[in-house]
């Protein structure tokens, strides 16, 4: 199709080489087409809809994204050629940063229902650059935490080194929806609830004498509880003896509950104690079996191919530790009578 009639938007993604970050493009169809195509079931052409780039009209979620090769080749369907780019409704998610994401991206409705819809498309020229200026050492992270029940703020990474006074007007989106009241480089949250978690996008316009473009950053916000003040507790094994059959295989499971910690380094190990000998057992990796906002249950198993007489003399010790402290639980094997 002819893309010369598409509206054009220029975007800049300046990514930090120190952290993982994502990026998004909205199928931000121009207002007149949006009112005609995207909201045709609900609005007359005279009514201008609220500016929601990735809103819930059934039509709007059914868009097609293309990339325009720089060598003039035909448009490429994003879904077929770019595994690190995911389409979710009207949004294009870039999972990894890199200058190779630079280029022209075009979106338009899949279903062309009338001659007016032919020009219902938008071309986004995306420029991707690594962050070079070391002047802003403490720029906001692309992953930010809000403590539930307290006040907090979400900072726009690309503007976090500027004071509120000198900051340009910012457009914020949360999970693709425009936050129309927010215009500053920081969103202040009076009281944090779990619904404040999500993907936030901040945009501002930058201009030079020739052109203007949108500088965009994406922030993943999670709501968290305060760090635990407790050492982990072992949920299993509960008993300190275990009845077994000699010659049979045996798996002993150690399950431990770890309270939430922002910097989470749980340790769960098995040891064998045999008189004055103690050593760490090589066992399969630990796995998380349940995770909630407040805590996580982690399990690690010790596997004996077959129980021997020698194993009856030993103690099998599960050891768990977090930044607060550690707990152990030992199990002695006893032959079934």
């Amino acid at each position: 199709f002819n893309i010369s009639g598409c509206s054009t938007k220029k975007l800049l993604w300046t990514y930090s080489t120190r952290s993982e970050e994502e990026f998004v493009l909205f199928c931000d169809l121009p207002e007149p087409q949006k009112s005609h195509f995207c909201h045709r079931n609900r609005l007359s052409p005279k009514q201008v809809p609220e500016h929601l780039p990735f809103m819930g009209s059934n039509d709007l979620s059914d868009v097609q994204w293309y990339q325009q090769p720089s060598n003039g080749d035909p448009l490429e369907d994003i879904r077929k050629s770019y595994p690190h780019i995911i389409q979710d409704k009207c949004t294009l998610h870039f999972l990894t940063p890199g200058v190779n994401n630079s280029g022209s991206y075009i979106c338009r409705p899949k279903m062309i229902k009338s001659p007016y819809d032919v020009a219902c498309c938008v071309k986004m020229i995306l420029e991707v650059k690594p962050q070079t200026n070391a002047s802003c050492e403490y720029s906001a992270s692309h992953k930010q935490d809000l403590l539930l029940g307290s006040t907090g703020s979400i900072s726009c990474p690309s503007l976090s080194c500027q004071s509120d006074a000198q900051s340009p007007a910012v457009t914020w989106y949360k999970n693709g929806k425009l936050l129309s009241v927010e215009r500053s480089n920081r969103i202040v949250v009076d009281e944090v609830y779990d619904y404040h978690q999500g993907t936030y996008v901040c945009d501002y316009t930058q201009s030079d004498t020739v052109s203007s473009w949108t500088v965009r950053a994406v922030v993943q916000v999670r709501t968290i509880v305060g760090d635990t003040k407790l050492k982990p507790d072992i949920l299993d094994p509960v008993e300190d003896t275990l009845e077994v059959e000699l010659g049979k295989p045996l798996t002993i499971s150690c399950k431990a509950r770890f309270g939430f910690e922002r910097v989470f380094n749980p340790v769960i190990k098995w040891y064998i104690k045999d008189s004055d000998l103690e050593w760490e057992v090589s066992v399969p990796e630990a796995k998380s079996i349940k995770s909630t906002l407040k805590d996580e249950i982690i399990e690690r198993n010790i596997i004996l191919e077959k129980v021997t007489q020698r194993d009856l003399r030993r103690k099998f010790v599960c050891f768990v530790q977090n930044s607060i402290g550690n707990t152990t639980q030992s199990v002695q094997l006893k032959e079934k009578r």
């Epitope: 190990k269 040891y271 008189s275 004055d276 000998l277 103690e278 050593w279 760490e280 010790v317 152990t328």
Partner: nanobody, 116 residues
Framework: EVQLVESGGGLIQPGGSLRLSCAAS????????MGWYRQAPGKGREMVSV???????NYADSVLGRFTISRDNAKNTVYLQMNALRAEDTAVYKC??????????WGQGTLVTVSS
Amino acid sequence: EVQLVESGGGLIQPGGSLRLSCAASGSISSRDTMGWYRQAPGKGREMVSVISSSGNTNYADSVLGRFTISRDNAKNTVYLQMNALRAEDTAVYKCYAHRTYGVDYWGQGTLVTVSS
């Protein structure tokens, strides 16, 4: 800071012998359990043999009768005499010291390759 430095690895023919040494420095105690673990390419780490300060030992079934562990408490050194080596003994051998639950130290490892 505890440091464990292994030596004695190398290329050896099947049926041959090697002796590994591990010198411990820093706050290592003669009360600590010491020993050897190994990790073959693409496999998990496995305990080969451990020894207590009093000389009590434990061996993996696969090396029983072929390998002998010993230690010199005065020198804070542990040895592993490996005889009748097989191709399946090829691995990086790491020295191990255990102070108490959760306090374990590992060496960088020495490569043992058994091949004709």
